[in-house]
């Protein structure tokens, strides 16, 4: 009795869904009551399918309402684990353990990344020096560096700070500021450059005609 996996690595985006599959041999018709399926993720039990039913009381709380065994796939010889609303904590090595006459197990790695897609921006001006402060902020994983460039492709020197997100423990909150003397309609770009998997996300900042003076300066 041998189980197989078509993929031993899945890469999924934070907040997305993933279905990981282990295939097991089924001759003729599946006898559900002879089938045993366990899914574990390191020290956490996710699925315990015995005697034709899933026992949710033994499921680890971190997977509650998010993980399920796709029962219809069992008849096709597939133990498919579906996880919805994927979290960074879901990353790791999963193990499917299947008993059907014989018994076997296989490991599958899940990697989770979070692109720095929603970049919020702010432009303010110092009334004394007339210097503009440009700010870009986004959350993602893993860590990113921020590259500032001008419309003529000059690389500019900004200041970046990285903190942990309030939303999720492992998510990074990356904020970068650029102080520069700029004129109206001038365009600047902040690019969040992330490695593993490599991805760039850029926001465009256009210097407005007139900026309101901060209330504290009035």
């Amino acid at each position: 009795f041998t189980i197989t996996v078509s993929k031993d690595l899945y890469v999924v985006e934070y907040g997305g869904n993933v279905t990981m599959e282990c295939k097991f041999p089924v001759e003729k018709q599946l006898n559900l009551f002879a089938l045993i399926v366990y899914w574990e993720m390191e020290d956490k039990k996710i699925i315990q399918f015995v005697n034709g039913k899933e026992d949710l009381k033994v499921q680890h709380s971190s997977y509650s309402q998010r993980a399920q065994l796709l029962k219809d796939q069992l008849f096709l010889g597939k133990a498919a684990l579906q996880i919805t609303d994927v979290r960074l904590q879901d990353a790791g090595v999963y193990c499917c353990l299947i008993g059907y006459g014989g018994a076997d197990y296989k490991r599958i790695t899940l990697k989770v990344h979070a692109p720095y897609r929603n970049i919020s921006q702010r432009i303010s001006v110092d009334p004394v020096t007339s210097e503009h402060e440009l700010m870009c902020q986004a959350e993602g994983y893993p860590e990113a560096e921020v590259i500032w460039t001008s419309s003529d492709h000059r690389v500019l020197s900004g200041k970046t700070t990285i903190t942990n997100s309030n939303r999720e423990e492992k998510l990074f909150n990356v904020t970068s500021t650029l102080n520069i003397n700029a004129t109206a309609n001038e365009i600047f770009y902040c690019t969040f450059q992330r490695s593993g998997p490599e991805e760039n996300n850029t926001a465009e900042l256009v210097i407005p005609e007139r900026l309101p003076v901060p209330a504290s300066e009035r």
């Epitope: 020290d43 956490k44 039990k45 990353a91 790791g92 353990l97 008993g99």
Partner: antibody, heavy 121, light 112 residues
Framework: QVQLVQSGAEVRKPGSSVKVSCKAS????????ISWVRQAPGQGLEWMGR????????NYAQKFQGRVTITADKSTSTAYMELSSLRSEDTAVYYC??????????????WGQGTLVTVSS | QSALTQPASVSGSPGQSITISCTGT?????????VSWYQQHPGKAPKLLIY???NRPSGVPDRFSGSKSGTSASLAITGLQAEDEADYYC???????????FGGGTKLTVLG
């Protein structure tokens, strides 16, 4: 109330093997992972491996790989741990322990009383 | 050499509070894994005190609490009592070893 009852103390010569049993009563045996943990005299706890009895699938700590075999008999709700090529450093109390709901390896809520294995020539 | 590092001993007087630390790495305590704590009296089997970092099984007094931050976990005992004198062990899953690991143990002495 779940109870794990282990076999009695054993004395073995270096190079030989020992097989310790752990009989469960008062709860579902086969679907919970059963681990074996040992404790040498005056030393700390050391995880050796685990089995899911309903599947008969066992995983072992790297240190014991090739020397330990964990098995289970669903019909008698008994788990077994066999350690071969015994040496004096294997003298220890061997415990079986059951993993609680939601977990696969740690978080042992029920323990056997322990079995002392003495390896001496 | 244990995978998780605990102080060899701690002590306190009755009524006092103590904390026992358990330091690991990113592959065990510092990962997404959960830490459990056990109490062991001489000649007895260990008893589960804390599971899943900070949860107490029924029957364990609320004087015992667990927490985790980064690659370290802690067991706190408030209002020390004579019967708390025992050895305490932390445990976690180690993803680099694909198995369970224990700390070396901490002997708690209740003075006086």
């Amino acid at each position: 109330q779940v109870q794990l009852v282990q076999s009695g103390a054993e004395v073995r010569k270096p190079g030989s093997s020992v097989k310790v049993s752990c009989k469960a009563s008062g709860g579902t045996f086969s679907s919970y992972a059963i681990s074996w943990v040992r404790q040498a005299p005056g030393q700390g706890l050391e995880w050796m491996g685990r089995i899911i009895p309903i599947l008969g699938i066992a995983n072992y700590a790297q240190k014991f790989q090739g020397r330990v075999t964990i098995t289970a008999d669903k019909s008698t709700s008994t788990a077994y741990m066999e350690l071969s090529s015994l040496r004096s450093e294997d003298t220890a109390v061997y415990y079986c322990a059951r993993t609680m709901d939601g977990y696969s390896y740690g978080n042992f809520d029920y323990w056997g009383q322990g079995t002392l294995v003495t390896v001496s020539s | 050499q244990s995978a998780l590092t605990q102080p060899a001993s701690v002590s306190g007087s009755p009524g006092q509070s103590i904390t026992i630390s358990c330091t690991g790495t990113s592959s065990d305590v510092g990962g997404y894994n959960y830490v459990s704590w056990y109490q062991q009296h001489p000649g007895k089997a260990p008893k589960l005190l804390i599971y899943g970092n900070s949860n107490r099984p029924s029957g364990v007094p609320d004087r015992f609490s667990g927490s985790k931050s980064g690659t370290s976990a802690s067991l706190a005992i408030t209002g020390l009592q004579a019967e708390d004198e025992a050895d305490y062990y932390c445990q976690s899953y180690d993803s680099s070893l694909s198995g369970s690991v224990f700390g070396g143990g901490t002997k708690l002495t209740v003075l006086g």
